[in-house]
């Protein structure tokens, strides 16, 4: 029995609903009484949802899953996952048994956009050319881990003296703090770009130092 799922991961934003598509081709005369359908987590084999003996057996996964009962007879074994959270990310296996047996796995990629970065400067007063300053770029509650890029006012990448840390909060979302140590020129703009690699979403922050005062666009 051929079971079909999408090749590419299903991308879902945290808090939204996702559909994990799975289909099979029922033979003429097929009835739901013949169908055994199991969704499980591929990595741990934990049961997620099942259908057997003509009945939806319900969600075994935090009561956040549902089948599409009206579409099962047409070979649609897709699973609806509600209120997606970081802990859902991973591979789900769809097992279908009628007379024959088939299975396939579909990946769920969870994502959350990063906030607009906030910029802080240390020290933040009495700055002169030649002073070493620490610029911190902070962006919050994104997923998965961000890519962080720094550049100067001319668009030249700044790769030295950068330290980036990413810590997950209780919801599994990452807070990113990237620190650039730089020797000040006469004046200058320093920008950080926080990129979500899954959403291809960029969040920008910058600070311009012009002797006195400083501005934070």
């Amino acid at each position: 029995l051929e079971v079909q799922v999408p090749e590419d991961p299903v991308v879902a934003l945290v808090g939204t609903d996702a559909t994990l598509c799975c289909s099979f081709s029922p033979e003429p005369g097929f009835s739901l009484a013949q169908l055994n359908l199991i969704w499980q987590l591929t990595d741990t084999k934990q049961l997620v949802h099942s259908f057997a003996e003509g009945q939806d057996q319900g969600s075994a996964y935090a009561n956040r899953t549902a089948l599409f009962p009206d579409l099962l007879a047409q070979g649609n074994a897709s699973l609806r996952l509600q209120r997606v959270r970081v802990a859902d990310e991973g591979s789900f296996t769809c097992f279908v048994s009628i007379r024959d047996f088939g299975s396939a796995a579909v990946s769920l990629q969870v994502a959350a956009p990063y906030s607009k970065p906030s910029m802080t400067l240390e020290p933040n007063k009495d700055l002169r050319p030649g002073d070493t300053v620490t610029i911190t770029c902070s962006s919050y509650r994104g997923y998965p881990e961000a890519e962080v890029f720094w550049q100067d006012g001319q668009g030249v990448p700044l790769t030295g003296n950068v330290t980036t840390s990413q810590m997950a909060n209780e919801q599994g979302l990452f807070d990113v703090h990237s620190v650039l140590r730089v020797v000040l020129g006469a004046n200058g703009t320093y920008s950080c770009l926080v990129r979500n690699p899954v959403l291809q979403q960029d969040a920008h922050g910058s600070v311009t130092i012009t002797g006195q005062p400083m501005t934070f666009p």
Partner: antibody, heavy 119, light 113 residues
């Protein structure tokens, strides 16, 4: 900053049940994490025992499944390990550890507690 | 279960020199849908719990010095310490995070020559 701390008796008699508790501070055990038990036999490698997830579901190492129970007390922000019918082969350092979602690597560990099985 | 085999068992390297540890899995740890290898590396010092260094084969954990790097794909993986420091003396473990039960290699002890 999340911290994990194991506690329980350091000496258990053969055939009895080993009971350990892991207390989690600064993070709720109902957040999007799995809470694991891992052990290390003296001078040897690491063995994953099992986990309890944010939702309360559990999974155990098949090699220990018949003897292991992992449970939790959300009001105390603790999770516990029970290993029954212990023998000298269960003498080890027992660690609790946290993994993010279904990323099954272990980011935060407790310091570990030594359990000796001996009469 | 996936069996993880590390080599060598121990390794003596001069300060400032490169240390290379190998890890082989009994089946592929590459997930085709996201092209990620589900392998982690840990460092353990005496009397301490293991410390996560690398996950997804090559992603450095926050705060880990960039002299530590991970590479490899499928069944063959390597942890490299580009310039060994005194504080790197420890036992290093690989772990597959692909399929339960999660399993570890037997460890490689790194010492100063």
């Amino acid at each position: 900053q999340v911290q994990l701390q194991e506690s329980g008796p350091g000496l258990v008699k053969p055939s009895q049940t080993l009971s350990l508790t892991c207390t989690v501070t600064d993070y709720s055990i109902t957040g999007d994490y799995a809470w694991n038990w891992i052990r290390q036999h003296p001078g040897k490698g690491l063995e994953w025992i099992g986990y309890i997830s944010y939702s309360g579901s559990t999974s155990y190492n098949p090699s220990l499944q018949s003897r292991v129970t992992i449970s939790r007390d959300t009001s105390k922000n603790q999770f516990s390990l029970k290993l029954s019918s212990v023998t000298a082969a269960d003498t080890a350092v027992y660690f609790c550890a946290r993994s993010l979602g279904r990323r099954w690597y272990f980011v935060v560990w407790g310091q570990g507690t030594t359990v000796t099985v001996s009469s | 279960d996936i069996v993880m085999t590390q080599s060598p068992d121990s390794l003596a390297v001069s300060l400032g020199e490169r240390a290379t540890i190998n890890c082989k899995s009994s089946q592929s740890l590459l997930q085709s849908s996201n092209q990620k290898n589900y392998l982690a590396w840990y460092q353990q010092k005496p009397g301490q719990p293991p410390k996560l260094l690398i996950y997804f084969a090559s992603t450095r954990e926050s705060g880990v010095p960039d002299r530590f790097s991970g590479s490899g794909s499928g069944t063959d993986f390597t942890l490299t310490i580009s310039s060994l420091q005194a504080e790197d003396v420890a036992v290093y473990y690989c772990q597959q995070h692909y399929s339960a039960p999660w399993t570890f290699g037997g460890g490689t002890k790194v010492e100063i020559k």
